[in-house]
Interface confidence: medium
């Protein structure tokens, strides 16, 4: 379970049409459900129930985005349509270059993602929790354009990376 170093850039437009970028760094973990790879793409927030839809034609994105999924408490969804692993697979099938799960409300998902699939996904599946998850979801919930870059090695100057 290697550390995933995630950088997120948020694009804030100004009335003049220019934009300002805000970069923030956070850490997560690569799960055994996916590959320990670098990835980058525009963030697409996905609702866990949205991944239940079987009609892939209806909900197909172009390839290359990073899916962000906030998992709910298990009690709120006692009979999920898909396992967490199934949700990761569905996101990758729909074109995600990586999937990031916020497991703060559902820590059991960590074990599910790390059970060691015989057929792991060829794209990274990362989970975040706590302060890192709050940071990520604050950006995602702004409903503005944001990009994520996932790295599998730590920066050699952490202060430079995290001092945003």
């Amino acid at each position: 379970k290697e550390t995933a170093f995630v950088e997120v850039v948020l694009f804030e437009s100004s009335p003049s049409g220019d934009y300002t970028t805000y970069t923030t760094g956070l850490t997560g973990r690569f799960s055994r459900a996916g590959a320990t790879l670098s990835a980058e793409g525009e963030i697409v927030q996905m609702h866990p129930l949205g991944l239940c839809n079987n009609n892939d034609e209806e909900d197909l994105y172009e390839y290359g985005w990073v899916g962000v999924v906030k998992l709910e408490q298990p009690e709120l969804d006692p009979k999920p349509c898909l396992t967490v692993l199934g949700k990761a697979k569905r996101a990758v099938q729909r074109g995600a270059t990586a999937v990031i799960f916020d497991v703060s409300e559902n820590p059991e998902a960590i074990d599910q993602l790390n059970q060691g699939s015989e057929d792991p996904l060829k794209r990274p599946v990362v989970y975040v929790k706590g302060a890192d998850a709050i940071k990520l979801m604050n950006i995602v919930n702004k409903q503005k354009v944001a990009r994520a870059r996932i790295q599998h090695r730590p920066p050699r100057q952490p202060t430079e990376y995290f001092d945003m």
Partner: antibody, heavy 120, light 107 residues
Framework: QVQLVQSGAEVKKPGSSVKVSCKAS????????INWVRQAPGQGLEWMGG????????NYAQKFQGRVTITADESTSTAYMELSSLRSEDTAVYYC?????????????WGRGTLVTVSS | DIQMTQSPSSLSASVGDRVTITCRAS??????LAWYQQKPGKAPKLLIY???SLETGVPSRFSGSGSGTDFTLTISSLQPEDFATYYC?????????FGQGTKVEIK
């Protein structure tokens, strides 16, 4: 103003390797992407891969995977691109490309290019 | 990989002409597109980023438009120094890919 200064032209035999260097002068690039883009004579531009020195991890285009290695030495603000198993089609100008700050996806800072000729 | 296709591959124009170059992506890339100018023996130069934002120091006769899969670079009044090759580049996802180039020649 950061400038990217590349090593000189190289002539190589097929099957050998070449290592091109790119030094940032007038600044450091520790948290800026350094990418390598090549251009064969009379042809278009082709992205080979890139690295962020503070991470040390590189991303490569599938076409070059296994044949190219991109590294960076923060202490000297120098990035390197090594291409192995050279063939005549690798004859090209190799550009070191970066951005003025942060991780980038558009290339606003270019080295002058290094001509690599592969000939027996 | 995302394929970028430019048209035309070359064109002849006169000083003062309005010139339009198009670039088509094989899938939607939102607005993650740049345009570069390259003169013989020189490194490319960034002109436009995010499909329509003008890079600092680039003359305002250059403009970009489009989103999704279809993009356009326009030079409103061609100047002698604008005769060059122009490339588009997608920045939506790895690997970054370029169009094959459009050469603008003197008529």
């Amino acid at each position: 103003q950061v400038q990217l200064v590349q090593s000189g032209a190289e002539v190589k035999k097929p099957g050998s390797s070449v290592k091109v260097s790119c030094k940032a002068s007038g600044g450091t690039f520790s948290n800026t992407d350094i990418n390598w883009v090549r251009q064969a004579p009379g042809q278009g531009l082709e992205w080979m891969g890139g690295i962020i020195p503070i991470f040390g991890t590189a991303n490569y285009a599938q076409k070059f995977q296994g044949r190219v290695t991109i590294t960076a030495d923060e202490s000297t603000s120098t990035a390197y691109m090594e291409l192995s198993s050279l063939r005549s089609e690798d004859t090209a100008v190799y550009y070191c490309v970066g951005g003025r700050s942060g991780w980038i996806w558009y290339f606003d800072l270019w080295g002058r290019g290094t001509l690599v000729t592969v000939s027996s | 990989d995302i394929q970028m296709t430019q048209s035309p591959s070359s064109l002849s124009a006169s000083v003062g002409d309005r010139v339009t170059i198009t670039c088509r992506a094989s899938q939607s890339i939102s607005r993650w597109l740049a345009w570069y100018q390259q003169k013989p023996g020189k490194a490319p130069k960034l002109l436009i980023y995010d499909a329509s934002s003008l890079e600092t120091g680039v003359p305002s006769r250059f403009s970009g438009s489009g989103s999704g899969t279809d993009f356009t670079l326009t030079i409103s009044s061609l100047q002698p120094e604008d005769f060059a090759t122009y490339y588009c580049q997608q920045a939506y996802s790895f690997p970054w890919t370029f169009g094959q180039g459009t050469k603008v020649e003197i008529k």
